[in-house]
């Protein structure tokens, strides 16, 4: 159930409507809960979460990552630069979230919910951003070939890729959450 649609909210019509910032905060935390459920299945199914071979697979993935220059960390914090990085990063993660769609047995719906909730989050953030011109959208053709390449990997690499996407997406969202709370 997406944030704002659970029974508690329905039962409390007198509650103040959420501000834009609160809605974004709640949306990110909802996605993080979904990621946690997916990571739980991944970690129970394989020993990827304990693996020291992550670096090998990580070299083949170009997962979005926060860096000091992006303005989202406490040192060198820059609201506008950071917001652009968050939106750009989420757009770049979309192809990886698409890859995750057929990777789960018992958490198939959860994987879909994470993907759809991320699309909603991007829309929320685009409304908040002043400098939309600075946001680069990934090329669909490049994404399509990346998806084909990821799906053609052997089983071990696919499991490792799934683990790395979830871990990186969690980390990216948590960095985003901390930064957005400063805005």
């Amino acid at each position: 159930v997406p944030p704002g649609e659970d029974s508690k909210d329905v039962a409390a019509p007198h509650r103040q409507p959420l501000t834009s910032s609160e809605r974004i905060d709640k949306q990110i935390r909802y996605i993080l809960d979904g990621i946690s459920a997916l990571r739980k299945e991944t970690c129970n199914k394989s020993n990827m979460c304990e693996s020291s071979k992550e670096a090998l697979a990580e070299n083949n993935l170009n997962l979005p990552k926060m860096a000091e220059k992006d303005g989202c960390f406490q040192s060198g914090f820059n609201e506008e630069t950071c917001l652009v990085k968050i939106i750009t990063g989420l757009l770049e993660f979309e192809v990886y979230l698409e890859y995750l769609q057929n990777r789960f047995e018992s958490s198939e719906e959860q994987a879909r919910a994470v993907q759809m909730s991320t699309k909603v989050l991007i829309q929320f953030l685009q409304k908040k951003a002043k400098n939309l011109d600075a946001i680069t959208t990934p090329d669909p053709t490049t994404n399509a070939s990346l998806l084909t390449k990821l799906q053609a990997q052997n089983q071990w690499l696919q499991d490792m890729t799934t683990h790395l996407i979830l871990r990186s997406f969690k980390e990216f969202l948590q960095s985003s959450l901390r930064a957005l709370r400063q805005m």
Epitope: M66, R167, S168, F172, Q174, S175, R181
Partner: antibody
Framework: QVQLVESGGGLVQPGGSLRLSCAAS????????MTWVRQAPGKGLEWVSS????????AYADSVKGRFTISRDNAKNTLYLQMNSLKSEDTAVYYC????????????????WGQGTQVTVSS | DVVMTQSPSSLPTSLGDSVTITCQAS??????LSWYQQKPGQTPKLLIY???KLQTGVPSRFSGSGSGTSFTLTISGLEAEDLATYYC?????????FGQGTKVELK
């Protein structure tokens, strides 16, 4: 079982430096946020600094910003706190703590604490 | 910065009493609040996280409530082993901050 063991504390003169270490065992260190918390003699707890898992993102209390540097070595399962330009008000027991989470929980909270290492800044 | 105001600073009480400690945040911190217990000469211990979630192994007489700016830690039926100092911590935005502490002692 989870263990956090701090070392590196001691007596130092004002303006001096110290490097605290925290050796972690019993859990997958790289998956967890880690934090330093301190407690001055007879006083309350003070959050000092946090370092996040893989992003390299760090945060500091205003009282230590620019003087202290938190870092981690995931290969060695060790957390560090480099303390420069020490002042008498930095005198405290320094605790290394693990943030709740890893794979599941995302909410802040420190579920494991080391025994602490005493730092005394005095001339 | 989010400032945490914890009250009271000292709470004289009797065994068996119900004890309530409050923490007020200067701005909304959602449910990013945890509570800790510290006994003299010991390291702090996590009791509650996420404002109301009981940490594994903590007795059920401890409970937390609140969201936004106002939070409460309740001990229902104080036991001798609960005599300690209690701290809240906001983990919502930098810099994170502890409350000043509440010392629960016998009258």
């Amino acid at each position: 079982q989870v263990q956090l063991v701090e070392s590196g504390g001691g007596l130092v003169q004002p303006g001096g430096s110290l490097r605290l270490s925290c050796a972690a065992s019993g859990f997958t260190f790289s998956n967890y946020y880690m934090t330093w918390v301190r407690q001055a003699p007879g006083k309350g707890l003070e959050w000092v600094s946090s370092i996040y898992s893989f992003s390299g993102d760090t945060a500091y209390a205003d009282s230590v910003k620019g003087r202290f540097t938190i870092s981690r070595d995931n290969a060695k399962n060790t957390l560090y706190l480099q303390m420069n330009s020490l002042k008498s008000e930095d005198t405290a027991v320094y605790y290394c703590t693990r943030n709740l989470g890893g794979v599941v929980v995302t909410t802040n909270g420190y579920d494991y604490w080391g025994q602490g290492t005493q730092v005394t800044v005095s001339s | 910065d989010v400032v945490m105001t914890q009250s009271p600073s000292s709470l004289p009480t009797s065994l068996g009493d119900s004890v309530t400690i409050t923490c007020q945040a200067s701005q909304s911190i959602s449910d990013e609040l945890s509570w800790y217990q510290q006994k003299p000469g010991q390291t702090p211990k996590l009791l509650i996280y996420g404002a109301s979630k009981l940490q594994t192994g903590v007795p059920s007489r401890f409970s937390g409530s609140g969201s936004g700016t106002s939070f409460t830690l309740t001990i229902s039926g104080l036991e001798a082993e609960d005599l300690a100092t209690y701290y809240c911590l906001q983990g919502y935005s930098w810099p994170f901050m502890f409350g000043q502490g509440t010392k629960v002692e016998l009258k």
